[in-house]
């Protein structure tokens, strides 16, 4: 008795494919050892055809694969383009030799089935339309035409030229002739369902002089495409259902026993389990669309189906496309926080992992929006301007070689709560979803800047101080000047560093920055923050206005700008989102379902940046106290 299990007998026809699953006991050794598929010879020797070590025999080249699923304790052998020569005895097994643990499989490949003479075979997927061609002689040109379906010895009429239609084919079958053709009629059957499969006979005329044609209709459920994805990575279902359903509502659903539960559709329905991590993107006017799901979980594995129907729900007899998604738990994508919490007026530092082999890729951060299909406009990127409404409070810090970049958002408001995506223009699997939860602040922020009304005068010296609590004593403190392409670290002076950590005086922990002399280009947002190595922590922001000595009125009212830093009024947040919408064309990389689109967004952002203000940090120098 072998502990390996699989199908004992597999039968198919020439040209078809088989997918043979072998089950093995769930042990660590079994999960990692070699898997093989070999053909049993008359001499008792079993010749390897394919193995998990990468071996592929000549006769299987280009038509076979072996995939191990350690989390399911199975491996699958896929063999395509079968011929009768593939008939034989095989073994699927585990071990370094072909004598280890195995299971015997008999494969029989027969010829395509024989049908009565003149039988035309039609193979169609569920939901599609078949056009059956019926030839007749001139003598029957004016005779009754019909199509019937064989049921045992009887043949039940489906449709005829007297306008009779069998009720089960109502609104689905039509009989017609094309142009001036006098020797052929056609029957269209649309919205095909499995029970339509069978042998049909079309007939012109009656009695012995009647012309008859046989048609064998095979109605297939679409072969699911197998998708193998890593835990925490992303998957894109590309759905192309054809022009005939271009104007119908589209959906993606997940098979659950006999039902298929809709995950998302174009009518606004969305499964809460996919909130924040799904996008449906129309591709063109021919009904093509794609659905992207990020942050894959173990429970996302299963059978998916996309389809189209005016109700946005699965409907028998409408075209579908199918996938089987496997989620590999041995993932290369690191586990990162899926929920980040912040408080109003505070800040968050979000670490976004990316493929370390692609350190030069463009990095982005976008805000998932729950409109009907979901969308994710870019808020910031390594070569993308920060979206309006986020100036002075959002920056992306790339850390080449570390396999991660950090996005900092400060001056938080409750409207910042929601889902955000980290993504790059490189490996599309590395897309992570973060839920940001912003609660009302109940205490003073950890970092405080003085003076809060920061107006500097050109030519003079201006010092600004950032007060930090003792818990940040050992961390690196920094000041940076925010610009559209990041926040550039400035020289600064840590007043508290001279004290010993034992006698930390809460009131005198200060890091200050001095502008000497103040220049016009010093105007803008400045951040005070703490970090430990590459790990960024709390930040706070202040707007420094710069005015001429002679003039009394600053360029921007600093009180207004800094009021926003403390708590943005609702009107302003609403205005921001409107402006963000207007700006979307600049930076929204078509919802990232297509990698080229992200690249385009990057290119365009690069172009914008070249013509914009790079935010020079010149003219700032540290205090030399």
């Amino acid at each position: 008795q072998s502990p390996i299990f699989g199908p004992q007998d597999v039968s198919s026809i020439e040209g078809n494919s088989v997918s043979i699953t072998c089950y093995y006991p769930d042990t660590s050794v079994n999960r990692h050892t070699r898997k093989y598929w070999c053909r049993q010879g008359a001499n008792g020797y079993c010749a390897t055809l394919i193995s998990s070590n990468g071996y592929l025999s000549k006769e299987y080249s280009g038509r076979a694969s072996l995939i191990n699923f350690p989390e399911n304790s199975t491996f699958v052998i896929n063999i395509a383009h079968l011929t009768q020569e593939d008939t034989g005895s095989y073994k699927c097994g585990l071990g370094t030799t072909n004598r280890g643990l195995f299971f015997d499989v008999s494969l029989e490949v027969s010829q395509v089935p024989e049908f009565p003479n003149d039988t035309h075979v039609y193979t169609k997927d569920i939901g599609r339309t078949v056009t059956i061609e019926c030839r007749f002689k001139e003598g029957n040109a004016h005779s009754k035409k019909s199509l019937c379906k064989k049921r045992g010895e009887a043949c039940e009429v489906v449709i005829d030229s007297t306008e009779y239609v069998d009720p089960s084919y109502k609104d689905r079958a039509i009989l017609f002739m094309k142009g001036t053709s006098r020797d052929i009629f056609y029957v269209n059957i649309s919205h095909l369902i499995p029970s339509d499969a069978g042998l049909y006979v079309c007939q012109a005329g009656e009695g012995p002089s009647a012309d008859k044609n046989n048609a064998d209709l095979q109605v297939l459920e679409p072969e699911p495409e197998l998708l193998y994805k890593d835990l925490r990575s992303s998957v894109t279902f590309e759905c192309d259902l054809g022009r005939e359903v271009a104007n119908d509502a589209k959906y993606l659903c997940r098979k659950n026993k006999e039902t298929c539960d809709v995950i998302i559709n174009t009518l606004g329905k969305r499964d809460p389990a996919f909130e924040g991590r799904i996008l449906l993107t129309p591709r063109d006017d021919n009904g093509r669309f794609s659905v992207l799901i990020t942050g894959l979980r173990k429970e996302d594995a299963g059978h998916y189906q996309c389809g189209a129907h005016s109700s946005g729900l699965p409907q028998e007899g409408w075209p579908v496309q199918a996938w089987q998604l496997f989620v590999n738990e041995e993932s290369t994508i690191p586990n990162s926080r899926s929920v980040v919490k912040g408080v109003t007026g505070g800040s968050v530092a979000i670490v976004c992992p990316y493929n370390p082999k692609e350190s030069s890729s463009l990095k982005y951060w976008c805000h998932w929006e729950a409109d009907e299909n979901g969308r994710c406009p870019v808020l910031v990127g390594t070569q993308a301007l920060v979206q309006e409404g986020y100036e002075g409070r959002l920056a992306l810090f790339d850390q080449p070689g570390s396999g991660a970049y950090t996005v900092i958002l400060n001056q938080l408001t409750t409207q910042d709560s929601g889902f955000y995506w980290c993504l790059t223009d490189g490996d599309s699997r590395w897309r992570t979803t973060i839920e940001l939860q912003v609660a009302e602040a109940t205490k003073k922020p950890d970092l405080e800047v003085t003076p809060q009304n920061a107006t500097a005068v050109i030519g003079e010296t201006f010092t600004i101080s950032c007060h930090y609590p003792c818990k940040f004593y050992s961390q690196e403190k920094y000041w940076c000047k925010w610009s559209n392409d990041g926040c550039h670290i400035l020289p600064s002076h840590d007043e508290g560093a001279r004290q010993s950590s034992v006698s930390c005086d809460q009131s005198s922990q200060i890091v200050s920055m001095t502008l000497n002399p103040v220049k016009k280009e010093d105007e803008g947002w400045y951040w005070c923050g703490v970090k430990e190595g590459q790990v960024y922590g709390e930040t706070t922001a202040i707007y420094v206005a710069v005015e001429e000595r002679t003039r009394g009125s600053p360029h921007i009212n600093p009180t207004d700008a800094n009021a926003r830093a403390k708590d943005a009024p609702e009107e302003e947040a609403m205005e921001s989102s409107v402006r963000e919408d207007e700006n979307k064309a600049n930076l929204d990389p078509r919802l990232f379902a297509d990698e080229r689109e992200i690249q385009n967004a990057g290119d365009q952002a690069q172009e914008n940046r070249a013509s914009g203000n790079a935010g020079s940090a010149g003219g700032q120098s540290g205090s030399s106290k």
Partner: nanobody, 129 residues
Framework: QVQLVESGGGLVQAGGSLRLSCAAS????????MGWFRQAPGKEREFVAA??????????YYADSVKGRFTISRENAKNTVSLQMNSLKPEDTAVYYC????????????????????WGQGTLVTVSS
């Protein structure tokens, strides 16, 4: 909804043969899986055989205890699955249940009862010595 009706059970002598049939009414399956399980008195229900299909491709699975003696087959047009049982032994005595799964894909391990969506009422097979 799919209903499964088993037939063909009865009393047979050891070494004899029986043919069980399971008819599925309702929707035609263009792909899916049907299987036979059995439950002997005082024992748990166990896997006997299964057949999966999609288009013209068929996969047949058997429990070690019935290999070479039982044969599972499917009649497409009638939506029925049969289990031909030869060389019957007294330990084959049990209630035999038919199970079905209607899916785009054959699914997981055919030996698992959770893999099936529909079940018949069962038919009793008694093998006397």
């Amino acid at each position: 909804q799919v209903q499964l009706v088993e037939s063909g059970g009865g009393l047979v002598q050891a070494g004899g043969s029986l043919r069980l049939s399971c008819a599925a009414s309702g929707r035609a399956f263009s792909s899916g899986r049907m299987g036979w399980f059995r439950q002997a008195p005082g024992k748990e229900r166990e896997f006997v055989a299964a057949i999966s299909w999609s288009g013209h491709t068929t996969y047949k699975y058997y429990a070690d205890s019935v290999k070479g003696r039982f044969t599972i087959s499917r009649e497409n047009a009638k939506n029925t699955v049969s289990l031909q049982m030869n060389s019957l032994k007294p330990e084959d005595t049990a209630v035999y249940y038919c199970a079905a799964r209607q899916s785009l894909v054959a699914g997981g391990d055919p030996r698992g009862q959770s893999e099936y969506d529909y079940w018949g009422q069962g038919t009793l097979v008694t093998v006397s010595s």
